[in-house]
Interface confidence: low
Amino acid sequence: VVSHFNDCPDSHTQFCFHGTCRFLVQEDKPACVCHSGYVGARCEHADLLA
């Protein structure tokens, strides 16, 4: 399934700890695109394998 992303509203700028917030249009929910070296639903964990 191809997910279509929108930018998150400004109110969600703090949603992702180490990443960029994107809204999943299909699901109407925020999701995180993690910066390199971070993992987790909100990019909250350092990736020990990175």
Epitope: N6, D7, P9, D10, S11, Q26, E27, D28, K29
Partner: antibody
Framework: VQLQQSGAELVRPGASVKLSCTAS????????MYWVKQRPEQGLEWIGR????????KYAPKFQDKATITADTSSNTAYLHLSSLTSEDTAVFYC??????WGQGTLVTVSA | DIQMTQSPSSLSASLGGKVTITCKAS??????IAWYQHKPGKGPRLFIH???KLQPGIPSRFSGSGSGRDYSFSISNLEPEDIATYYC?????????FGGGTKLEIK
């Protein structure tokens, strides 16, 4: 945070009406604005929503041809336009922001 | 779109007692459910979001639980001001849907 809705409307069958919802204490561009319908003695129905930052809208299927949601970020106001009104459209219409903040409702009465 | 079946449609309970309202979704909604209190002449008031998270200012005698398709909302130590209609709302996908509502009365 406050949402102030426009006053009650008495409209003729077949006519249209445009309701307003003006926000204070926040910028409507920051999140979605929603509209909800409640007919007399009935439950709540989700009409749809708009992302005021870009104008993107989404509607419940039953309201697709009935409702049009718009927003004017310069006046911090969201609008609900209802067309081809019938007695089934007699209801209170609520606007909401971020699912948590609600207006006081606008009563629309459709009557000849 | 997702259907939300809320029960009961009305209930009567005693002051100080406990009531539970349930909502069953037509598919898994991943805990994306909110509960509202609605009183005549006012806008609905959000009490709980994401299944169990209480909104600021809502007393702890209100609670929510559930997962998958089945969710519940409970009020303990019922007080006169709890008289209202309560609704569930699923927001798991683009098309939000409310349950049919539960009208709470005090015996």
């Amino acid at each position: 945070v406050q949402l102030q809705q426009s006053g009650a409307e008495l409209v003729r069958p077949g006519a249209s009406v445009k309701l307003s919802c003006t926000a204070s204490g926040f910028n409507i561009k920051d999140d979605y604005m929603y509209w909800v319908k409640q007919r007399p003695e009935q439950g709540l129905e989700w009409i749809g929503r708009i992302d005021p930052a870009n104008g993107n809208t989404k509607y419940a299927p039953k309201f697709q041809d009935k409702a049009t949601i718009t927003a004017d970020t310069s006046s911090n106001t969201a609008y609900l336009h209802l067309s081809s009104l019938t007695s089934e459209d007699t209801a209170v219409f609520y606007c909401a922001y971020r699912r948590a903040y609600w207006g006081q409702g606008t009563l629309v009465t459709v009557s000849a | 779109d997702i259907q939300m079946t809320q029960s009961p449609s009305s209930l009567s309970a005693s002051l100080g007692g406990k009531v539970t309202i349930t909502c069953k979704a037509s598919q898994d909604i991943n805990k994306y459910i909110a509960w509202y209190q609605h009183k005549p002449g006012k806008g609905p008031r959000l009490f709980i979001h994401y299944t169990s998270k209480l909104q600021p200012g809502i007393p702890s005698r209100f609670s929510g639980s559930g997962s998958g398709r089945d969710y519940s909302f409970s009020i303990s130590n019922l007080e006169p001001e709890d008289i209202a209609t309560y609704y569930c709302l699923q927001y798991d996908n683009l098309l939000y849907t409310f349950g049919g509502g539960t009208k709470l009365e005090i015996k």
